[in-house]
């Protein structure tokens, strides 16, 4: 007995599509072996039509695909544009066609519905609109027009030209009589329900000379599209419901027990707590289409999702809908990285962001998720040398360590930095990841002076005190600019006296600027790293002024404490040109991120997602 299982009989109609699911024992070998769909010949052979290794027969070109779902031990063969020629006996199987690991499937495609017995067939998706056209003769032009639905043996009046509307259709049906030139009336039914399906009769006149027309209304539930994404990765649901619902509230919901569909996000401002910080509903286009991006995919995100339109912002009978079945692949190509990073006020964080290592040349971005309205993620920094103005001197995106990971360093932390941040690139959109920054109680580990003033032509020495916990780390000074932080020579001055209960392993490392010039003005960072992995940093702003008295400047921590607040220095900053694009459509198109910039400073949410993967600001 073969361990492969599937549907023994599949029946469909011409022009339709089928999705045939074949089940196999999900052993390691089976997961990775060839999957195939073949047609059995009269003489016993089985000719491959499509396989998981990329082969597609010319008979199936452009209308079929085979998708393997190793997590579930299934593969699915989708065949569209069916014709009666597709009727026959098939096998779905694993390995080689002639071996026994297969299951026999009978596919029968019958003739599509036509104008049989003068019946017009209307095939419409659930929630959409149908227009039933009813012709009549001149003698019935002034007579009553009506539409009936056949319920069992009895016709039940649905609507007529005298104003009657059956209660089941209230608010979603109308009868239109065309201009005098056209001998036609139409009945338009909106927000179609499954219960609307059936036989209808339209009639003009009530006597034996009345004109009658039969209609068969078929209401289809939408085919769920199978979506298969990696754990920790990202998914985008593109929802196109048609221009007729362009001004109706939109929603994405996830089916839970039974037929309940819990709202994930909607355009009325509702968002499920489980998706805080990792979801965006993109502004909709004029045609009513919109998209929803979810990052940081979790195992529990798998399930059936519906998008739709309804004034309540949630699924109701008659909502036009689109459906997806999301599978989350736990054998993910996306590496684990901390979902929570903790830092202290005044301190720093170093965030590791994964990207697809095949796209090392892609532009890297970091953005701040904002929960207002439908969610947005204005960019803060990119790998091409752009940094949002408010973050100058305290934010840097580094290509290190490379090979599938980049680093974002943010220092001078305040409570306003708490929130959710997204790592992304202009390449593979599935690699968007989310990290939450939490600001916790504590003191920064690195001690530097506040803001420092250097004198033109003189020497300036700036100290950085490293506690003993960083004894094994490499210590450095660098000068910040838009493209990163260029390393500078520094001197180890021996043990630091800035730490209580810290032994000889503490260190004072100084930055020396000889013969200061105007070009030396700017932000300097001291920090620690291990190889290409960065730890904590501390920032100092060095201002440069004209000589007042001779000599060199040696800055101490005591002087630093009295330094003016950093806001005083703002006027001295070079303002980066405003690269903002209003209403940034960051994720509306897969590649649209490339030139999106946003300078607006919005509210920042700080929500505890309860993640178990946490990272302190000073560790990696």
């Amino acid at each position: 007995k073969s361990p492969i299982f599937g549907p023994e009989e599949v029946n469909s109609v011409e022009g339709n599509s089928v999705s045939i699911t074949c089940y196999y024992p999900p052993t390691s070998v089976n997961r990775h072996t060839r999957k195939y769909w073949c047609r059995q010949g009269a003489r016993g052979g089985c000719i491959t039509l499509i396989s998981s290794e990329g082969y597609v027969s010319s008979k199936y070109a452009g209308r079929a695909n085979l998708t393997n779902f190793p997590e579930n031990g299934t593969f699915v063969v989708n065949i569209a544009q069916l014709s009666q020629d597709d009727s026959g006996r098939y096998k779905c199987g694993l390995g080689i066609n002639s071996r026994g690991l297969s299951f026999d499937v009978s596919l029968e495609v019958s003739q599509g519905p036509g104008l049989l017995n003068d019946t017009k067939v209307y095939t419409v998706d659930l929630g959409r609109t149908v227009t039933i056209n009813c012709p009549f003769k001149t003698e019935n032009a002034q007579k009553r027009k009506s539409l009936y639905k056949q319920i069992g043996l009895y016709p039940v009046l649905v609507i007529d030209s005298s104003g009657y509307v059956n209660p089941n259709y209230t608010g979603r049906i109308r009868l239109d009589i065309q201009g005098t030139g056209q001998l036609l009336f139409s009945v338009v039914i909106n927000q179609l329900r499954l219960s609307d399906a059936g036989q209808y009769l339209c009639q003009a006149g009530d006597d034996s000379n009345s004109n009658k027309k039969n209609a068969d209304l078929q209401v289809l539930k939408p085919e769920p599209e199978l979506v298969y994404e990696d754990l920790r990765g990202s998914v985008t649901f593109h929802c196109a419901l048609g221009p007729e619902v362009a001004n109706v509230a939109k929603f994405l919901c996830r089916q839970s027990s039974g037929e309940n569909c819990d709202v994930v996000v909607n355009t009325l401002g509702k968002r499920a707590p489980a998706f805080e910080g990792r979801i965006l509903l993109n502004p909709q286009d004029k045609d009513g289409s919109f998209s929803v991006v979810i990052t940081g995919l979790r195992k529990e995100d798998a399930g059936r999702y519906l998008c739709g339109a309804h004034s309540d912002g949630q699924l109701q009978e008659g909502s036009p809908i689109q459906a997806w079945q999301l599978f989350v692949n736990e054998e993910s190509t996306i590496p684990r990285s901390p979902t929570v990073v903790k830092g202290v006020a005044g301190g720093s964080v170093a965030v590791l962001c994964p990207y697809n290592r095949k796209e090392s040349k892609s532009i890297k971005y970091w953005c701040l998720w904002e929960g207002a309205q439908n969610g947005r993620c204005p960019l803060l920094v990119d790998s091409e040398g752009w940094v949002k103005a408010q973050y100058e001197g305290r934010l840097s995106l580094l290509e290190e360590p490379g090979n599938g990971t980049f680093t974002v360093i943010l220092n001078q932390l305040t409570s306003r930095d708490a929130g959710f941040y997204w790592c992304l690139t202009n390449g593979d959109t599935l690699w968007r990841t989310t990290v939450e920054i939490k600001i916790i109680e504590g003191e920064p580990n690195l001690k530097v002076p506040g803001n420092v003033t250097a004198v033109l032509g003189e020497t300036l020495k700036v100290p950085c005190h490293f506690p003993c916990k960083f004894s094994s780390y490499e210590k450095y000074w660098c000068k910040w600019n838009n493209t990163g932080c260029q390393a500078l020579p520094s001197q180890d001055e021996g043990p630091s006296k800035a730490f209580v209960n810290c032994d000889e392993n503490s260190r004072l490392v100084s930055l020396t600027l000889n013969l200061v010039t105007r070009a030396d003005e700017g932000w300097y960072w001291c920090g620690v790293k291990q190889g290409h992995f960065y730890g904590e940093t501390a920032a100092v702003y060095v201002a440069v002024e004209e000589r007042k008295a001779a000599g060199s400047r040696d800055v101490s921590l005591a002087k630093a404490d009295a330094a003016p607040d950093e806001k005083v220095l703002d006027s001295g900053f070079r303002e980066i040109e405003n690269k903002a694009i209003q209403d940034p459509r960051l994720f509306a198109e897969e590649k649209a991120v490339a030139d999106t910039r946003d300078q607006a400073d919005g509210s920042r949410a700080s929500v505890d997602s309860g993640s178990s993967e946490e990272q302190g600001g000073s560790s990696r």
Epitope: V10, N11, S12, V13, S19, L220, E223, G258, E259, E317
Partner: nanobody
Framework: EVQLVESGGGVVQAEDSLRLSCAAS????????MGWFRQVPGKEREFVAA??????????YYDDSVKGRFTVSGDNAKNTLDLQMKGLKPEDTAVYYC??????????????????WGQGTQVTVSS
């Protein structure tokens, strides 16, 4: 409240035929998949047959033990399910349960896939 009600069970002779029916009510939307399972005392519920609807396509699944003898049919708009059983054998004796799965996902043969269940109808085949 969702209800699935089976009917048509009874006592028959080996090689006789029987038709089981199941009517579902209270499902907010029509079910995407319905199935028949059976259980004998002291054993786990086992898959018999299932039918799935998607768009205008119908998919029928059978356990090897009933292939060629049992035929599953139904109407997803009306949420009805039938099981025509021919050539019945004593080993077909069991309580037969009707099940509905609105979501169409998960293995058709696994009872845990189905969210709604009937109370069962007894089928006894005597030799």
């Amino acid at each position: 409240e969702v209800q699935l009600v089976e009917s048509g069970g009874g006592v028959v002779q080996a090689e006789d035929s029987l038709r089981l029916s199941c009517a579902a009510s209270g499902l907010p939307f029509s079910s995407s998949r319905m199935g028949w399972f059976r259980q004998v005392p002291g054993k786990e519920r086992e898959f018999v047959a299932a039918i799935g609807w998607s768009g205008r396509s119908t998919y029928r699944y059978y356990d090897d033990s009933v292939k060629g003898r049992f035929t599953v049919s139904g109407d997803n708009a009306k949420n009805t399910l039938d099981l025509q059983m021919k050539g019945l054998k004593p080993e077909d004796t069991a309580v037969y349960y009707c099940a509905a799965d609105p979501n169409y996902y998960g293995d058709v043969r696994t009872s845990g896939t189905y969210q709604y269940w009937g109370q069962g109808t007894q089928v006894t085949v005597s030799s």
